[in-house]
Amino acid sequence: SGTTNTVAAYNLTWKSTNFKTILEWEPKPVNQVYTVQISTKSGDWKSKCFYTTDTECDLTDEIVKDVKQTYLARVFSYPAGNVESTGSAGEPLYENSPEFTPYLETNLGQPTIQSFEQVGTKVNVTVEDERTLVRRNNTFLSLRDVFGKDLIYTLYYWKSSSSGKKTAKTNTNEFLIDVDKGENYCFSVQAVIPSRTVNRKSTDSPVECMGQEKGEFREI
């Protein structure tokens, strides 16, 4: 019986947002399956997603163990199903992924404005501190817990009646800005890690405007 031809995986790509991390690859399998292995530079290869016909593997559980480590994955191809094959002691075909350092490379998810509160000519805008899948002492850490002061938020705000935008920055999750009395404002925020060279900014949050449910207004 002849040896089955398997095709090595290619286009191995890390897709990661707020540390939820999936390795994707091609091609869709025909008479073959894949197993993924992941390792740190100094560590052992750990098998995941055994003998799958998927072309993705969720590696979040592995990378959250130490988000500052650099990881490498590889995808093995095996013949499978009703195919002719002969036993072989050699390793199956595999392809390596690019290196991936979650802390430096995970995309920042779209932030959400949790609330805003006007007190006279001041507005306090609070950004939701999104929970990640990174754990410490059996509890999930927030984005702020993980990144600390490396993470800042930029607030874009403007009068509902005009298009001129102003900006503010904070290394917490709150802004306190001055506004004109009697004017309604709209807000949008963006997460930023200034020290990064790639994936520095998130997409902008959905716009929230005063006069809608999220806000609380107190005239002093």
């Epitope: 399956v33 560590g43 052992d44 290869w45 750990k46 098998s47 055994f50 003998y51 016909t53 163990k65 093995f76 095996y78 013949p79 499978a80 199903g81 009703n82 195919v83 002719e84 094959s85 390793e91 199956p92």
Partner: antibody, heavy 118, light 106 residues
């Protein structure tokens, strides 16, 4: 070559615990999942659980949850399976087995007979 | 859990004959694995991922099937092939084994 050598036969009282060892050689112990499977006399095979020695990650068959603990000692390249609250139904041959290319039960230890009797 | 039913439970054949062993799954599974076990020994992997021969397994062994029905065929029985054969799945947790088919000398 890959070798898995298990500890010797054990006779235990009902309600007690047993700890079976599996010493690995011929490969990098911490790099491969190790599994435990048992076979009652004249019966089929039953998966108990598994461990990845590299980081201690483990998973168990729900049928054994709470009674079984699988550990690994990287310094001695040895995996352990401890089963507590033994009953006569736990009398079986216990095997350790290692993943290989294309299969998770590719290499097997010789088996350890555990007899539970009062 | 997935229940694997093997048939027949006992197969009495002579050396040189063809053996066909069946394994039926209670739900569709992706792949099947087959093991051979002789008295007093650990199981030995024969077939992985439905049809792939494990390293060192003679070409007289072959596997086929899909969904819920899988077969192991031994094209011409050799004296050393008389043993118990188990099928196994791990498409779903927990992994499960069939009850076994004993192939004995007629």
């Amino acid at each position: 070559q890959v070798q898995l050598v298990q500890s010797g036969a054990e006779v235990k009282r009902p309600g007690s615990s047993v700890k079976v060892s599996c010493k690995a050689s011929g490969y990098t112990f911490s790099s491969y999942w190790m599994y435990w499977v048992r076979q009652a006399p004249g019966q089929g095979l039953e998966w108990i659980g598994q461990i990845y020695p590299g980081d201690g990650d483990s998973n168990y068959n729900e049928n054994f949850q709470g009674r079984v603990t699988i550990t690994a000692d990287k310094s001695t390249s040895t995996a352990y399976m401890e089963l507590s609250s033994l009953t006569s139904e736990d009398s079986a041959v216990y095997f350790c087995t290692r993943e290989g290319y294309g299969n998770r039960f590719a290499y097997w230890g010789q088996g350890t007979l555990v007899t539970v009797s009062s | 859990e997935i229940v694997l039913t093997q048939s027949p439970a006992l197969l009495s054949l002579s050396p040189g004959e063809r053996a066909t062993l069946s394994c039926s799954a209670s739900s569709s599974v992706s792949y099947m694995y087959w093991y051979q076990q002789k008295p007093g020994q650990a199981p030995r992997l024969l077939i992985q991922l439905t049809s792939n021969l494990a390293s060192g397994v003679p070409a007289r062994f072959s596997g086929r099937g899909s969904g819920t029905d899988f077969t192991l065929t031994i094209s011409s029985l050799e004296p050393e092939d008389f043993a118990v054969y188990y099928c196994q799945q791990w498409s779903y947790n927990p992994p499960t084994f069939g009850g076994g088919t004993k192939v004995e000398i007629k």
